[in-house]
């Protein structure tokens, strides 16, 4: 009867230059318990050579000589008495491709090479590339340990080699980036930055590289109020805004963080569960009106903590004129002039284009003021008669601008009564 | 128990051929490199060359590339050696020897076979 | 070239013998064995392998028989000499192709 040697390889394995595979394997041979117990070796061998003669790939044998170019690369996993002959193949070269057949000896019995069951070896090129390993998201401020590896590469041949690049780790001393792994304690400047690990087998043109994109996670660092896509100057986290009255408001609130804060405005300095007036970071407020005067706070929610800035909104206008109008009265001519406006404007007289400042000193003229509500009102007594034509002219004005009114007082008739004098405004 | 079997050989011819065998038995065919040696009367030995099954790969001395072609045929378990366009120098005694082993040696020979070429 | 001497040994029984070979380069094998055997060849037989791989003894080979040697020089000693020794005996390289024999040693009684 024959004696009965088999074994179980795939035909073909196809691995990536510079990984690792394991080709499972199993074989049997003719062994009698009866006989002597000779130990029992095996071997791998390059298709075409002669086991008797030829380096081996890999070999449980200690006094066989391996390849130089395999030694280390291809060994023998599990355990040859189990009848495993299982071969790891490591950090694959290109040359490694090719047929490989199994070979048993054992004492003078047993020497069977199976050339009927070869393993085909293809190395292709690397399309593999590494994995960069970290917990995220990734926090500013919180140091994290990010590791490099590449699926399918082992311990096996020359180490691999590995540099880390990406503005993220520009402070950082340039051993670091050597390793497989490194700690980064993100900024917020880091995030959406490139961070690439890459990795290259030593003595090998073998070169792989990952690019991954950070997503940093940070609270607002700082909020920005824009109006019309100008950003509002900031001090001590507050913003001072004029705005006209009766004018429409556009504000938006940019507070830069990732993931994005969620915006809020309040009216006035709100308590940490007050309601807001807006639940994005658009303040729109159609017409302002004086009653608005105070503030507004933009409020940036982050899980990583809030940030606020207040905004001093003062309302102002331009003055309103209402005359002047002047009548005769006792005590001489008398022009009336009202004016409103914020902040309150200041007012003067004049006579035929000459200032009349506060009250004659020959008590040719007299000035007085008051206010009643946003109105306020100024008079001028002229004492005598008017001796030609007089223009009376009253000028309000504040910081935002002026508005001026006049009378032309006609000398007509004498005695005019107490009439409003016909003027030529 | 490995035996090599020889046969063919004999009284041949001036420029005529002879093939001899060398019938293995005993052990995996495709497991023992099978050489070829020449014996002239009365004289040392010289290396042929070998044929091995496993891989049917051939080696030859340079000296006897033209003389000798081996070949086998593995459903008998047999290998062959031809010798062609043969003359008085060809007469010798050839035996074939099995070769098994990284301890590269010929640990069986066939019991030889003798070849005369005369008119 | 494999260069043997003596071409004849005269010898007594129980005698030490002793057979030189000398090569004509390194006989290492590019995987690092050295492939040097003795073979015994007795008057109408077939050469008998008696050492392999310079100094292994082949199965059933008798111990007084030992080989030693390394590059280029390779000697083969019988320590004493028994009637069944007696034959030519032949080196061997199986390193380099052409694989050659030396021209033989005659071990004959004195």
């Known amino acids: 009867e024959k004696p009965v040697y088999e074994l179980q390889v795939q035909k073909s394995v196809t691995v990536q230059e510079g990984l690792c595979v394991l080709v499972p394997c199993s074989f049997s041979y003719p062994w009698r318990s009866w006989y002597s117990s000779p130990p029992l070796y095996v071997y791998w061998f390059r298709d075409g050579e002669i086991p008797y003669y030829a380096e081996v790939v890999a070999t449980n044998n200690p006094d066989r000589r391996v390849k130089p170019e395999t030694q280390g690369r291809f060994r023998l996993l599990g355990d040859v008495q189990k009848k495993n002959c299982s071969l790891s193949i490591g950090d694959a070269r290109m040359e490694d491709t090719g047929s490989y057949f199994f070979r048993v000896e054992r004492g003078r019995d047993v020497k069977y090479s199976y050339q009927q069951n070869k393993l085909n070896l293809e190395v292709t090129a690397l399309i593999e590339k590494p994995d960069i390993h970290f917990l995220e998201p990734l926090e500013s401020g919180r140091p994290t340990r990010l590791s490099c590896s590449l699926p399918g590469s082992c311990e096996a041949g020359p180490p691999l080699t590995f540099s880390w690049t990406g503005n993220a780790l520009s402070p950082l001393d340039p051993e670091t980036t050597r390793s497989s792994e490194l700690t980064l304690t993100p900024r917020p400047e880091d995030h959406g930055t490139n961070l690439t690990c890459q990795m290259k087998r030593q003595g090998a043109q073998v070169t792989t590289e990952r690019t991954v994109q950070l997503n940093v996670s940070y609270a607002p660092q700082t909020i920005t109020i824009f109006r019309n896509g100008i950003a509002l100057e900031i001090l001590q986290n507050t913003s001072y805004l004029p705005v006209l009255e009766g004018q429409a408001l556009r504000l938006l609130c940019d507070a830069p963080s990732n993931p994005p804060a969620h915006l809020s405005w309040f009216q006035g300095s709100p308590a940490l569960n007050a309601t807001p007036i807006s639940n994005t970071g658009i303040l729109e407020l159609r017409r302002v009106r004086s009653a608005e005067e105070g503030g507004f706070t933009c409020r940036a929610q982050h899980p990583l903590g809030f940030l606020q800035i207040f905004l001093n909104l003062s309302v102002y206008s331009l003055p309103q004129l209402l005359g002047p109008s002047c009548s005769w009265e006792a005590e001489g001519l008398h022009c009336r002039c009202s004016f409103r406006a914020r902040p309150a404007p200041s007012l003067c007289w004049r006579l035929e284009e000459k200032p009349l400042e506060g009250n004659s000193s020959q008590g040719s003229f007299k000035v007085n003021s008051s206010s009643a509500g946003p109105w306020a009102n100024s008079s001028l007594i002229l004492h005598g008669g008017l001796s030609s034509d007089l223009k009376v002219s009253c000028k309000a004005w504040n910081i935002y601008g002026s508005q001026s009114g006049s009378v032309l007082l006609l000398q007509g008739r004498s005695n005019l009564g107490t009439g409003v004098v016909p003027a030529a405004l | 128990q490995v035996q090599l079997q020889q046969s063919g050989g004999g009284l041949v011819k001036p420029g005529t051929s002879v093939k001899l065998s060398c019938k293995a038995s005993g052990y995996i065919f495709t497991e023992y490199i099978i050489h070829w040696v020449k014996q002239r009367s009365g004289q040392g030995l010289e290396w042929i060359g070998w044929f091995y099954p496993g891989i049917i790969s051939i080696k030859y001395n340079e000296k006897f590339k033209d003389k000798a072609t081996l070949t086998a045929d593995k459903s008998s378990s047999t290998v062959y050696m031809e010798l062609s366009r043969l003359t008085s120098e060809d007469s010798a005694v050839y035996f074939c020897?099995?070769?098994?082993?990284?301890?590269?040696?010929?640990?069986?020979w066939g019991q030889g076979t003798s070849v005369t070429v005369s008119s | 070239l494999m260069t043997q001497t003596p071409l004849s040994l005269p010898v007594s029984l129980g005698d030490q013998a002793s057979i030189s070979c000398r090569c004509s380069q390194s006989i290492v094998h590019s995987n690092g064995n050295t492939y040097l055997e003795w073979y015994l060849q007795k008057p109408g037989q077939s050469p008998k392998l008696l050492i392999y791989r310079v100094s292994n003894r082949f199965s059933g080979v008798p111990d007084r028989f030992s080989g030693s040697g390394s590059g280029t020089d390779f000697t083969l000693k019988i320590s004493r000499v028994e009637a069944e020794d007696l034959g030519v005996y032949y080196c061997f390289q199986g390193s380099h192709v052409p694989w050659t024999f030396g021209g033989g040693t005659k071990l004959e009684i004195k």
């Open positions: 020897a099995g070769h098994e082993g990284y301890d590269g040696a010929m640990d069986y």
